[in-house]
């Protein structure tokens, strides 16, 4: 019962930490527009993977993709790539837990072949949890490193009296959300492998019980037909029924004149 | 049809106080960010103070900060301006502008209202 | 705080006539996040109150004749008048619209010859 519920309780939290990889992989909020210390703008800068938004002060957002593949930062790409694996090894992952959770029957399949896929889907989730916090980690490296440098030429003359003013970028929710659903993914899938063990099959030796009948000795051995049959003799064949009940100011969106990307 | 519509304007002594009112109709008032832009007699134009829709966010221009006050109450419709501590250089026509959808920019204004500070 | 400077300060045209007003910005008015130069130019007629005519440098408002053109970026910014026609006769503002305070220029005055 406890392995049952260290498979399903790991699965779950795979399952919140993939739904968690994926949303902050499509997040805008990956990088938004330092306030503090900095000019008072009437317009909100924000980044994600995908597209760098602007919201004005009315709550008019702008949101524009990143068109060119060759023009954007090796890193970004790196971050881009490693989230895309994160969500696609958490995806066949879950794929392979829902067959292997024991309270799930799938036609005659054995305990054995559930522990190898329980272990499969760990490793899985382990190292899709992996790759959510590196990508997100190397986000969050590029952002540091980029807010200090921004920070040591804040203004950047421009000849004269006339001076840009460099807008500045700190760790936005989606960093956040990624650390966590990494976190959580991770952890699932350490549980998994932890309900790995429970479900691999124990080496029992069984003791033959002979039933005398009248004229004829024969000896029935549990497993005797398993065996024949090509399955391991010694296979626990427990069916467990498991219930698997598992639970800014307002701003406004207006009607644009402009088309958004 | 887009209506601002302000009042309150009169003759303060130097160091008075008045509150001026704008009064909005013809749109959701409660949706719009609104601006306070002052102009002095002859003179160009100098913005005063914003507040956001749900009044989450102020800001004043350095001339009035701590001595004016921005408020709104959405339900009445109604933008106000408490003006403090009044200077001669604070005699102008106040107007109410409207933030407008797009590039942070007063796409309606008042026919405004004159305050005119004199002992 | 923004300084905005506008020249010339007055300009004298007949009808007609193409006429073309400056404005430079202390800092760059353009958001690289949208590629948006937050720039306004507003028109002010005698005994009115401001109206708005161009908003992010170069977008039209709705109801503007298209004789009004507003360009520029960065820091330096003009509008455009390609034909004045009488009602043009006013003052014309530019506002920074992207830092507070939001400051406005000192104003182009436009008459008639």
């Known amino acids: 019962m406890a392995v049952t519920a260290c498979q399903g309780l790991g699965f779950v939290v795979s399952l919140i930490g993939i739904a968690g990889i994926i949303a902050a992989t499509c997040m805008d909020q990956w990088s938004t527009q330092d306030l503090y210390n900095n000019p008072v703008t009437a317009v909100f800068n924000y980044q994600g993977l995908w597209r760098s938004c602007v919201r004005e002060s009315s709550g008019f957002t702008e949101c524009r993709g990143y068109f060119t593949l060759l023009g954007l930062p090796a890193m970004l790409q790196a971050v881009r790539a490693l989230m895309i694996v994160g969500i696609v090894l958490g995806a066949i992952g879950l794929l392979v837990s829902i067959f292997a959770l024991k309270c799930i029957r799938i036609g005659s399949m054995e305990d054995s072949a559930k522990a190898n896929m329980t272990l499969t889907s760990g490793i899985m989730f382990i190292v899709s949890g992996l790759c959510a916090i590196a990508g997100v980690s190397v986000f969050a490296n590029m952002l540091v490193t980029n807010f200090w440098m921004s920070t040591a030429n804040m203004y950047t003359g421009m000849g004269g009296m006339v001076q840009t003013v460099q807008t500045r970028y700190t760790f936005g929710a989606a960093l956040f959300v990624g650390w966590v659903a990494g976190g959580l993914t991770l952890i699932g899938g350490v549980m998994m492998c932890i309900a790995c063990r429970g479900l691999a099959p124990e080496e029992t030796n069984y003791k033959a019980v002979s039933y005398h009948a009248s004229g004829h000795s024969v000896a029935y051995k549990p497993g005797g037909f398993k065996a024949s049959t090509g399955f391991g003799s010694n296979t626990k064949n427990k069916k467990i029924y498991d219930g698997g009940a598992r639970t800014e100011d307002e701003v406004q969106s207006y009607p644009s004149k402009h088309d958004y990307v | 049809d887009v209506q601002l519509v302000e009042s309150g304007g009169g003759l303060v002594q130097p160091g008075g106080s008045r509150k001026l009112s704008c009064a909005a109709s013809g749109f959701t008032f409660s949706r719009f960010g609104m601006h306070w832009v002052r102009q002095a007699p002859k003179k160009g134009l100098e913005w005063v103070a914003y507040?956001?829709?749900?009044?989450?966010?102020?800001y004043y221009a350095d001339t009035v900060k701590g001595r004016f006050t921005i408020s709104r109450d959405n339900p009445k419709n109604t933008l106000f301006l408490q003006t403090t501590s009044l200077r001669s250089e604070d005699t102008a026509i106040y107007y109410c502008?409207?933030?407008?959808?797009?590039?942070?920019?007063?796409?309606?204004w008042g026919q405004g209202t004159l305050v005119t500070v004199s002992a | 705080n923004i300084l905005m400077t506008q020249s010339p300060s007055s300009l004298t045209v007949t009808a007609g006539e193409k006429v073309t007003m400056n404005c430079k910005s202390s800092?760059?008015?353009?958001?690289?996040?949208?590629?948006?130069?937050?720039l306004t130019w507003y028109q002010q007629k005698a005994g009115q109150p401001p109206k708005l005519l161009i908003y992010w440098a170069s977008t039209r408002e709705s109801g503007v004749p298209d004789r009004f053109t507003g360009g520029g970026s960065g820091t330096d910014f003009t509008l455009t008048i390609s034909s004045v026609q009488a009602e043009d006769l006013a003052l014309y503002y530019c506002?920074?619209?992207?830092?507070?305070?939001?400051?406005f220029g000192a104003g182009t005055k436009l008459e008639l010859k």
């Open positions: 507040i956001s829709s749900g009044s989450n966010t102020i």
């Open positions: 506002q920074n619209s992207y830092y507070y305070p939001l400051t």
């Open positions: 800092q760059s008015l353009l958001n690289g996040g949208n590629q948006r130069n937050y």
């Open positions: 502008g409207r933030l407008g959808f797009y590039g942070n920019s007063f796409d309606h």
